[in-house]
C-alpha cells in the first residue's frame, strides 16, 4: 500500500523521541535500499515480459520528468529536505506500481514481496528524515509532489511508467547513498 504521505507537521510535534545515531540509521537505510535496487529493477522488467527486457533504454530509461531534484553538495538540512521530497515521491510511486502489478501480474509474488519490502524501508526512512528535520532543524513543513497517477493508464503505459520509475529509483538511490 502507498506510504502515508502527510507533509511534515507544521508544529513539528514528534510523538516519539528520535533514535540515537539518527544519521547513521538514515545512511544504513539508504545503503539497504541501494543494495536491493538493481535486483528490484531486474525482477520488475522481467515480470513485464516482452518487449521490456530487450528494450530497457527505450522503455525503462530514468527519464521521469517531474522527479524531485537532489543536490549532493548542499548543506545537511537542504539535502534532508530534498531527500524527504524524493522519499515521498518514491513512496507514492511504489504504491501505484504495487497496486498495478497485483492486477497485471498477480502471480509475480517475489516481485510483490520485494516491492512491499522496499516500501517498508522507505516508510522507516521517511520517519527518520522527519525526526531529524524536526529535532535538529525545526523544519515544520516541506512541500512535496507525488508520483504519477497510473490508475487511468492502459496496460502498456502502467508497465512502462513503473519501469521508468524503478530505473530512476535505481539511479537516484545510488546518488543518495553516496551523498549521506
Amino acid at each position: 500500500s502507498p506510504l502515508p504521505i502527510t507533509p511534515v507537521n507544521a508544529t513539528c510535534a514528534i510523538r516519539h523521541p528520535c533514535h540515537n545515531n539518527l544519521m547513521n540509521q538514515i545512511r544504513s537505510q539508504l545503503a539497504q535500499l541501494n543494495g536491493s535496487a538493481n535486483a528490484l529493477f531486474i525482477l520488475y522488467y522481467t515480470a513485464q515480459g516482452e518487449p521490456f527486457p530487450n528494450n530497457l533504454d527505450k522503455l525503462c530509461g530514468p527519464n521521469v520528468t517531474d522527479f524531485p531534484p537532489f543536490h549532493a553538495n548542499g548543506t545537511e538540512k537542504a539535502k534532508l529536505v530534498e531527500l524527504y521530497r524524493i522519499v515521498v515521491y518514491l513512496g507514492t510511486s511504489l504504491g501505484n506500481i504495487t497496486r498495478d502489478q497485483k492486477i497485471l501480474n498477480p502471480s509475480a509474488l517475489s516481485l510483490h514481496s520485494k516491492l512491499n519490502a522496499t516500501a517498508d524501508i522507505l516508510r522507516g526512512l521517511l520517519s527518520n528524515v522527519l525526526c531529524r528535520l524536526c529535532s535538529k532543524y525545526h523544519v515544520g513543513h516541506v512541500d512535496v509532489t507525488y508520483g504519477p497517477d497510473t490508475s487511468g493508464k492502459d496496460v502498456f503505459q502502467k508497465k512502462k511508467l513503473g519501469c521508468q520509475l524503478l530505473g530512476k529509483y535505481k539511479q537516484i538511490i545510488a546518488v543518495l547513498a553516496q551523498a549521506f
Epitope: D100, D154, V155, F156, Q157, K158
Partner: antibody
Framework: QVQLQESGPGLVKPSDTLSLTCTVS?????????WSWIRQPPGKGLEWIGY?????????YYNPSLKSRVTISVDTSKNQFSLKLSSVTAADTAVYYC????????????WGQGTLVTVSS | DIQMTQSPSSLSASVGDRVTITCRAS??????LAWYQQKPGKVPKLLIY???TLQSGVPSRFSGSGSGTDFTLTISSLQPEDVATYYC????????????FGGGTKVEIK
C-alpha cells in the same frame, strides 16, 4: 443489473457536430472503469473512438485518426459520459456504442444497445 | 502503432465442424486479447478475454489460445446459433493505435 443507454439525434448534417450521451444505470461510476465510445459503419467492422477514465487523473485516449475531431467528457453527478465529434461527413454514419471496461481496461465487458447516427443533409 | 489482422475474413462450415479463426498483432500484446461475437443487428458480446479466459455464460465449445502476437479462437463443434461475425481486440496499448479491433471474421453455415 448494469445498463448503458445511448441517446442523441439520429440525424446530423454534414459539417455539424455529432453529440451523444451514454447514461449508466444500476452502477455507480467507479474510479477503476474506463468509459468508451465504439462505432460501426453499416456493413463494416468495429472502430474504437476513445475513452475517458472517471478518476482523479481524468485520463482520456482518442483514436489518432479521429483525435482532432473528438471530445469525450463525463458528468459523474448524472452517471453520464458524452461524445462530441465535430465536422462530420457521410463517413461518420454508423451505429455508435458506449461501452465500459474494468481495470486494467483490456476488454469491454459492458455495452450499450447502440444508436444509429446518419450524417446527411 | 499496433495493427490487428484477422483471418479469414469469412468462412463457411458445416454444423459440428471445428472452426478456427486467427488474429495476429503487429507487435507483442502479451496475453491481452479479447474475442467478441456479433450477431446481425445485435450488440457485440464478449466471449473470451486475456486470450483464453471464457466469459461467464459462454458455451464451453468456444476456446481461445495464444500469446505475444498470434492468437486463435476455436469453436470445437459449430452450432447454427454460432452464425455471426467474430472480432478480436487487443487491450494492451491504446496509445497511437488507430483501431484496437481486428477486421472481423464472418462465420456462416454451409
Amino acid at each position: 443489473q448494469v445498463q448503458l443507454q445511448e441517446s442523441g439525434p439520429g440525424l446530423v448534417k454534414p459539417s455539424d457536430t455529432l453529440s451523444l450521451t451514454c447514461t449508466v444505470s444500476g452502477f455507480s461510476f467507479s474510479t477503476d472503469y474506463w468509459w468508451s465510445w465504439i462505432r460501426q459503419p453499416p456493413g463494416k467492422g468495429l472502430e474504437w473512438i476513445g475513452y475517458i477514465y472517471v478518476g482523479t487523473s481524468g485520463d482520456t485516449y482518442y483514436n489518432p485518426s479521429l483525435k482532432s475531431r473528438v471530445t469525450i467528457s463525463v458528468d459523474t453527478s448524472k452517471n453520464q459520459f458524452s461524445l462530441k465529434l465535430s465536422s462530420v461527413t457521410a463517413a461518420d454514419t454508423a451505429v455508435y456504442y458506449c461501452a465500459g471496461a474494468d481495470n486494467p481496461y483490456d476488454y469491454f465487458n459492458l455495452w450499450g444497445q447502440g444508436t444509429l447516427v446518419t450524417v446527411s443533409s | 502503432d499496433i495493427q490487428m489482422t484477422q483471418s479469414p475474413s469469412s468462412l463457411s462450415a458445416s454444423v459440428g465442424d471445428r472452426v478456427t479463426i486467427t488474429c495476429r498483432a503487429s507487435e507483442t500484446i502479451s496475453g491481452y486479447l479479447a474475442w467478441y461475437q456479433q450477431k446481425p443487428g445485435k450488440v457485440p458480446k464478449l466471449l473470451i478475454y486475456r486470450a483464453s479466459t471464457l466469459q461467464s455464460g459462454v458455451p464451453s465449445r468456444f476456446s481461445g489460445s495464444g500469446s505475444g502476437t498470434d492468437f486463435t479462437l476455436t469453436i470445437s463443434s459449430l452450432q447454427p446459433e454460432d452464425v455471426a461475425t467474430y472480432y478480436c481486440q487487443q487491450g494492451y496499448s491504446y496509445s497511437d493505435t488507430d483501431n484496437v479491433f481486428g477486421g472481423g471474421t464472418k462465420v456462416e453455415i454451409k
